[in-house]
């Protein structure tokens, strides 16, 4: 089943998805679709990334965290209710069938009122020190191994954590760090 | 210590083509980006396109498919643009620059720049 | 593409003042975005990178900020070495670009 998220009408929704990239340069492609992961691929793509950029983005849609460390959460910009629904996470790890693919459910709230101030990047720019990458040691003796070698136990606990979308509400609006 | 040691300058006529080459050291060359940057004279900074020597993959400025080419040899540890078709356009200075993955594949260290000039 | 946009073009500063530098990008880009100073004859050098961070050895009056459309170099206490042009540029989506510069001049 799907993890719920939650957003109100006018503010910035967060959607969260991270692997582990295994060397510099060796990003794995990742795509962001809009309803359940299907087979292959993501349906009506809203972003994509590929060995080394966002090579492609619809309007309102776009990677605050690091990207190119393996945070590829989507944060969805001034958010109606027509964004609720199905969004598909799917890291495109090279080899048949080896694909991770995370289905997470919008859920689009009325404003109560007029939409406060959101200190969602705040909380968005938090989570990636939730993700510990490999140490790569140092930066000029790196050597590159010929496939990615994703550990994907981050995603796993990171959706748990927040599988309670009040408490991911709560953090975002007081503007909590989690370390 | 890092070095990105760029090609002289180069006079050459319209309509010519044109390589120029950046070679590294003091790094593991496979393990990076080679970007590309041009600089006309007294203005701003164009992209043009990177290659990873790791695997030979490259990716170009829309603006300079079919004028630039880039290529790598892996044994001298050595990057290469070929300009075609050369006009007065394409009289400024190229810089080879290494994408670094840990500046998030901004620039931390650019060659001293190749002057390019076409003229009749 | 995404266009960088700075401003000022031109920024006259007295020594020992504060020197503010504007990027705006046409799109968002997360914290993709980079500082360069170039001075005349050298090619550009890397001051800050993913929007905030400092690169080895910049001295500490630089410092970057912001997040998605707007971005911000400031030179804390300006030095008679730092009369350069600076860039920003945005390394989020290819085509890179960067901004026409602001050149940085003493008062």
């Known amino acids: 089943s799907e993890v719920e998220y939650r957003a109100e009408v006018g503010q910035n929704a967060y959607l969260p998805c991270f692997y582990t990239p295994a060397a510099p340069g060796n990003l794995v492609p990742v795509c962001w679709g809009k309803g359940a992961c299907p087979v292959f691929e993501c349906g009506n793509v809203v972003l994509r990334t590929d060995e080394r950029d966002v090579n492609y983005w619809t309007s309102r849609y776009w990677l605050n965290g690091d990207f190119r460390k393996g945070d590829v959460s989507l944060t969805i910009e001034n958010v109606t209710l027509a964004d609720s629904g199905i969004y598909c996470c799917r890291i495109q790890i090279p080899g048949i069938m080896n694909d991770e693919k995370f289905n997470l459910k919008l859920v689009i709230k009325p404003a109560k009122v007029t939409p406060a101030p959101t200190r969602q990047r705040d909380f968005t720019a938090a989570f990636p020190r939730m993700l510990t990458t490999r140490g790569h040691g140092p930066a000029e003796t790196q050597t590159l191994g010929s496939l990615p070698d994703i550990n994907l136990t981050q995603i796993s606990t990171l959706a748990n954590e927040l599988r309670d979308s009040r408490l991911a509400n709560d953090l975002r609006d007081s503007g909590a760090t989690i370390r | 210590q890092v070095q990105l040691q760029q090609s002289g300058p180069e006079l050459v006529k319209p309509g010519d083509s044109v390589k120029m080459s950046c070679k590294a050291s003091?790094?593991?060359?496979?393990?990076?980006?080679m970007d590309w940057v041009k600089q006309s004279h007294g203005k701003s900074l164009e992209w043009i396109g990177y290659?990873?020597?790791?695997?030979?993959?490259?990716s170009y400025n829309q603006k300079f498919k079919g004028k630039a080419t880039l290529t790598v040899d892996k044994s001298s540890s050595t990057a290469y643009m070929e300009l075609h078709s050369l006009t007065s356009e394409d009289s400024a200075v190229y810089y080879c620059?290494?994408?670094?993955?840990?500046?998030?594949?901004?620039?931390?260290?650019w060659g001293q720049g190749t002057t390019l000039t076409v003229s009749s | 593409d995404i266009v960088m946009t700075q401003s000022p073009d031109s920024l006259p500063v007295s020594l020992g003042e504060r020197a503010t530098i504007n990027c705006k990008a046409s799109?968002?880009?997360?914290?993709?975005v980079a500082w360069y100073q170039q001075k005349p004859g050298q090619p550009p050098k890397l001051l800050i990178y993913y929007a905030s961070n400092r690169y080895t050895g910049v001295p500490d009056r630089f410092s970057g900020s912001g997040s998605g459309t707007d971005f911000t170099l400031t030179i804390s206490s300006l030095q008679a070495e730092d009369v350069a042009v600076y860039y920003c540029q945005q390394h989020y989506s290819s085509p890179y670009t960067f901004g026409q510069g602001t050149k940085l001049e003493i008062k």
């Open positions: 003091g790094y593991t060359f496979t393990d990076y980006y």
């Open positions: 290659i990873y020597p790791n695997n030979g993959g490259t």
């Open positions: 799109q968002s880009v997360g914290n993709n």
């Open positions: 620059a290494r994408g670094g993955y840990y500046s998030y594949y901004s620039y931390d260290y």
